[in-house]
Amino acid sequence: ATKLTEEKYELKEGQTLDVKCDYTLEKFASSQKAWQIIRDGEMPKTLACTERPSKNSHPVQVGRIILEDYHDHGLLRVRMVNLQVEDSGLYQCVIYQPPKEPHMLFDRIRLVVTKGFSGTPGSNENSTQNVYKIPPTTTKALCPLYTSPRTVTQAPPKSTADVSTPDSEINLTNVTDIIRVPVFN
């Protein structure tokens, strides 16, 4: 059975988190998608959302967050550029499907941002520069404010897969396996 799991990313200030959430494209291709942060004991907070209906590979930029929805692949790409320590937290992608509750996607992302310059530009650190070559899109669609109370959970156990290194965004080449922590079954 599919498990809702979390994956941990340890990055330095100034680096870029570059992740993807997959979804069933037949069901959700043009649905509005959102990137949320889950703070302990609080309702998930929506930070950015795609347009409604979501447009294919059309970047939407909200501050330091860029969302890009690849309809024809069932992939939502999320980039958070120029990371700050205060960006640390638990994140998730959801699909809005009013009047039903938002549909949560796999996996949750546990982001840990630490201080300190990374030295050599990281593996994808230049994507910070790349990002601003995308014409920023001001999305006219407002992100729905409601969120399912069902998604409020206790802070899940932390993953021990601290796999990134100071000079790379994510470097798994010396890791034999990833520990994915089930949040609930």
Epitope: V19, L25, F106, D107, N124, S127
Partner: antibody, heavy 123, light 107 residues
């Protein structure tokens, strides 16, 4: 160590379907995406698509979209790629490949490759 | 789709030579570029990821550089086992595409 072992060579007639299997070992199968890449004899590499073994979701490039199905059996850590309505130009070696990082990472670096399955389409 | 153009398509070199292969993207791909080696009858092998990072276990004579649209793959001192075909691959967006390959032959 990580291993991807694919099913054996197949000879098919035009219009038929082929299902290639890819058995993973040496890691947690549901933790990494599986991609499929093909290579016609003497030609370059062509990416076909991806599958997340945890969610079961998959996506493929336009040219294959109506003909390819990517599935998995988590109980046996096996991924499958089925290609239908075969034509002679589908004659190629088909590779299953595991990515370098988390399923959630935008990191499409093809780190671990199966040995390849030759599919020959001939009347 | 992003087109990846490798040059040259083939080259002849001798053991000990320094060899350079270039890959040009049809638009800016930042550092989202990988390099692979493929020997006849074998699966490709990842050598360099993210334009310049050496994959674990790959000899240090292999290196990669570049950003944006122009990338370079270098073998500092060619060894007999390096004669193979080399491919670049981008992942700046979907679909992922490969270069057409560079065949490296013994002179």
């Amino acid at each position: 160590q990580v291993q991807l072992v694919q099913s054996g060579a197949e000879v098919k007639k035009p219009g038929a379907s082929v299902k290639v299997s890819c058995k993973a070992s040496g890691y947690t199968f549901t933790s990494y995406d599986i991609n499929w890449v093909r290579q016609a004899t003497g030609q370059g590499l062509e990416w076909m698509g991806w599958m997340n073994p945890n969610s079961g979701n998959s996506g493929s490039v336009k040219k294959f979209r109506d003909r390819v199905t990517m599935t998995r059996d988590t109980s046996t850590s096996t991924a499958y790629m089925e290609l239908s309505s075969l034509r002679s130009e589908d004659t190629a070696v088909y590779y299953c490949v595991r990515l370098i990082g988390y399923s959630s990472a935008w990191k499409w670096s093809f780190q671990h490759w199966g040995q390849g399955t030759l599919v020959t389409v001939s009347s | 789709d992003i087109q990846m153009t490798q040059s040259p398509s083939s080259l002849s070199a001798s053991v000990g030579d320094r060899v350079t292969i270039t890959c040009q993207a049809s638009r800016d791909i930042s550092k989202y570029l990988n390099w692979y080696q493929q020997k006849p009858g074998k699966a490709p092998k990842l050598l360099i990821y993210d334009a310049s990072n050496l994959e674990t276990g790959v000899p240090s004579r292999f290196s990669g550089s570049g950003s944006g649209t122009d990338f370079t793959f270098t073998i500092s001192s060619l060894q007999p086992e390096d004669f193979a075909t080399y491919y670049c691959q981008h992942y700046d967006n979907i679909p992922i595409t490969f270069g057409q390959g560079t065949r490296l032959e013994i002179k």
